[in-house]
């Protein structure tokens, strides 16, 4: 049986839109159906319709099709907003260029190349012919429009109104000539919908024949309209998935604009000392990845062959072996000179200060009255008066309404980490604003601490070295997997939430990650009965400078004999010096025959001042850090353990007091480890758990 082609790719979709006919003479036809695809197939074939179908509306609420012999450009018609409607217009009737020989062209050009008006197809004056609309059904020989019903070489043509000239081609440009792009086409939003070999593009909102991750609702800024060519992932030029099952995707033939300069809106802010956003504009000279491995030159093919060359990416400044972000990755990166590590991120480059001009706050910003109304990720704040119900849900006093004007960043709940606001995005209910503490402000944001001073953390590799294999129940320990390999540790603090480190996420694509719970062996050997494998649905980045991430699981973990949660400390608490604690990890461990088993190293808490002395005064610790030293020489956290916990026991209760982050040395005698102090961020963690929606089991 011949499979009917899916014709919805031939339509331009306008969501939440319908057409209203002002002219009562215009016909429409309706019928109950299940999907927009069914409407499209019938429209394309004109089956059972008393007119040539040019557009249709799918009514999602009533599951109904409305077929039209007109489109939004026709006279006697107007567009109207409607939540339940999606308008689909046949692209052939709205396109003003041709593809190939123009057989499918159904536009309204009616003048020949030399400027002669076309003769109507239904007329025999001045030229008799056999191209009757009735003989060429589906070829749309309407009015006197240029057409190419037989797909002949010269493109669309018509009989002319000049008795001396029987027929002539029309001057309709190729779509590939009309369309042009700048740079690598990341900002291209044109209407090219077929590949360089002529294959029709698959709609971005479809998953057949090719399943993919580029869902329009997931990437609203990437322009995934209909089935138009786009460049969302740093390819050399725009591309699309195709309707050919054996050609997953292909490039599109879009020429470079004569003036190949990027619009001001597309140019990333150039920086040389720090990273703004994802660092697409970083033009500095750092040339090693985060752990010190040197970068491979962009113009070299050794040790890694690649096509990310200066010739392919002329606008991206791929000079020497400097860290760059030419493809919209998480941050600047490079190919490495280690044959076993293809790429690495240069996460040691600091973020630029995001503060807006002179705007700053004192203490924790509860008295901040500036007029910034944007979150650190660029979302516009939503009005406080629309969110009062949510605010009351997590504070136990009446907020000062006089301060909560408009949608300005404020701190009505005494958040330790500064002003914030609600957003209109249901996935990110609220976030902090990009405002720094005022320079010279030393007001502690929490009490009971030594003098808070600024830290100067350096990035070094960390892994649990010479630890002993654990045997006790550590069901809260999580192995974060990146592209099927263990990359980091983490702690299960709630059924749907894992506390881990920011450095554990080299890619923004959440499909690259999984959380393994209930395992003892890093490869899951022998843990089959107790292992739970969960996808990751969201990353919530901690307050600026925290290095923390709360990772939301796609479904809640099932708590059992092998999987459990670990408690958080009270906000701002301190734990006595010499308290015995432990760090856990699967990082490679200094042993030649590494067995892949989870290991523990025993440490004890050390005061911040004493800790600083052990670091020979080169390190000053602040209120967001906690220090722990090894009981035996050379035992402590190292690479592969980032994100894992420093666990301490007090009053018979085990808590996660610290998180391992790239930091201050690896198991060096008399050099204690420095961890992110969870107690300092406990309120933030509780606030996220309380306000972010989680899936139900």
């Amino acid at each position: 049986q011949r499979k009917r082609r899916n014709t919805i790719h031939e339509f331009k979709k306008s969501a939440k839109t319908t057409l209203i006919k002002i002219d009562p003479a215009l016909k429409i036809k309706t019928k109950k159906v299940n999907t927009a695809d069914q409407c499209a197939n019938r429209c394309t074939r004109n089956k059972g319709l008393p007119f040539t179908c040019k557009a249709f509306v799918f009514d999602k609420a009533r599951k109904q099709c409305l077929w039209f012999p007109f489109n939004s450009m026709s006279s006697g018609v107007k567009k109207e907003f409607g939540h339940e409607f999606d308008l689909y217009e046949n692209k052939d009737y709205i396109r003003n260029c041709i593809i190939g020989k123009g057989r499918s062209y159904k536009g309204t050009v009616s003048i020949t190349k030399s400027g002669i008006k076309c003769q109507p197809w239904s007329s025999m004056i001045p030229h008799e012919h056999s191209f009757l609309p009735s003989s060429y059904r589906g070829k749309d020989l309407q009015e006197n429009y240029c057409r190419n019903p037989r797909g002949e070489e010269g493109g669309p043509w018509c009989f002319t109104s000049n008795p001396e000239v029987r027929y002539e081609v029309c001057d309709i440009p190729q779509c590939s000539e009309v369309e042009c792009m700048t740079c690598n086409g990341e900002s291209y939003r044109g209407l090219m919908d077929h590949t360089e070999s002529g294959k029709i593009c698959q709609r971005w909102d479809h998953q057949t024949p090719h399943r993919h991750k580029f869902l329009p609702e997931r990437y609203p800024d990437k322009g995934f309209d209909d089935n138009y060519c786009r460049n969302p992932d740093g390819q050399p030029r725009p591309w699309c998935y195709t309707l050919d099952p054996h050609t997953r995707w292909e490039y599109c033939a879009i020429k470079t604009c004569a003036d190949n300069t990027m619009n001001d809106t597309d140019v990333p802010l150039e920086t040389t000392e720090c990273i703004q956003g994802q660092g697409e504009g970083y033009r500095g000279t750092v040339n090693t990845i985060w752990n010190g491995i040197p970068c491979q030159r962009w113009d070299s093919q050794y040790p890694h062959e690649h096509d990310m060359t200066p010739e392919n990416f002329k606008c991206k400044d791929l000079r020497e072996n400097y860290c760059r972000n030419p493809d919209g990755s998480e941050s600047p990166w490079c190919f490495t000179t280690d044959p076993n590590i293809r790429v690495g991120y240069c996460s040691q480059i600091p973020n630029c200060d995001m503060s807006h001009g002179q705007d700053c706050y004192r203490g924790n910003g509860k008295n901040y009255m500036g007029n910034l109304s944007q979150t650190r990720s660029g979302l516009t704040c939503s009005m406080w008066d629309k969110n009062m119900e949510d605010l009351h849900r997590h504070i136990f006093w009446e907020p000062d309404a006089s301060k909560l004007n408009e949608n300005y960043c404020r701190n009505p709940d005494d958040d330790a980490h500064g002003p914030w606001c609600y957003t209109g995005n249901p996935l990110i209910p609220w976030d902090y604003c990009p405002i720094s503490r005022c320079e010279g402000d030393t007001t502690p944001t929490i009490v009971n601490l030594d003098h808070p001073v600024i830290s100067c953390a350096k990035t070094k590799q960390l892994r649990v070295v010479n630890g002993i294999p654990t045997r006790t129940n550590i069901g809260w320990m999580v192995s974060l997997r990146y592209r099927n390999k263990h990359i980091c540790g983490g702690s299960l603090i709630k059924e749907s939430w894992v506390l881990t480190a920011r450095q554990c996420f080299p890619s923004r694509d959440l499909k690259d990650y999984e959380a393994w719970l209930g395992i003892h062996d890093v490869h899951g050997r022998g843990d089959e009965k107790c292992k739970q494998v969960l996808n990751v649905s969201q990353l919530v980045y901690g307050p600026e400078g925290s290095d923390l991430v709360l990772m939301k699981l796609a479904r809640p973990a099932v708590l059992d004999d092998f999987v459990s949660t670990i408690d958080l400390p009270n906000y701002g608490c301190t734990i006595p010096e010499k308290t015995s604690c432990s760090v856990y990890g699967w990082g490679y461990t200094g042993l030649i025959n590494y067995d892949g088993l989870l290991r523990v190293a025993h440490l004890y808490i050390m005061g911040n001042e004493k800790c600083s002395q052990h670091h020979r005064g080169k390190v000053t610790l602040n209120e967001s850090e906690i220090c722990a030293g090894a009981e035996k020489i050379g035992s402590g956290p190292c690479e592969g353990d980032y994100g894992g916990p420093l666990v301490c026991e007090q009053h018979k209760m085990r808590m996660v007091l610290g998180v391992i982050v790239p930091g201050r040395g690896c198991a060096i005698p008399n050099r204690p480890g420095i961890f992110v102090r969870v107690a300092y961020y406990a309120k933030w963690i509780h606030k996220i758990i309380l306000t972010y929606k989680v899936p139900q089991s």
Partner: nanobody
């Protein structure tokens, strides 16, 4: 545009060897990076091995490292996958894939544009 046809699959015993071939036509084979992926029913296609256009760079999935070798013969427009010490868990449909562009990654499905129909490999215990 590249067309790919795999061959060499079949039924073998655990511990045996097998050599898969993938013949390319209709494009410039020498300018394509090549890879093998495999798929078992109800699972996503998984990466097995890749080889750069020059043949100088190869990558392998951990699950096949040391047991599989990918190679290419640009004169014959063919890429090979030599599989030794086969295990029952190697049972899958094996697909050949071609890429015109390698960026930061070379092991994901989206790194490859053109795909063959697949050849079945069954390893019995």
């Amino acid at each position: 545009e590249v067309q790919l046809v795999e061959s060499g699959g079949g039924l073998v015993q655990a511990g045996d060897s097998l050599r898969l071939s993938c013949a390319a036509s209709g494009g410039t084979f020498g300018s394509s990076h090549m890879a093998w992926f495999r798929q078992v029913p109800e699972k996503e296609r998984e990466f097995v091995a890749a080889i750069s256009r020059s043949g100088g760079t190869t990558y392998y999935a951990d699950s096949v490292k040391g047991r599989c070798t990918i190679s290419r013969d640009n004169a014959k427009n063919t890429v090979y996958l030599q599989m030794n010490s086969l295990k029952p868990e190697d049972t899958a449909v094996y697909y050949c894939a071609a890429a015109r562009f390698w960026g930061s990654t070379s092991t994901r499905m989206d790194d490859y544009q053109y795909w063959g129909q697949g050849t079945q490999v069954t390893v019995s215990s």
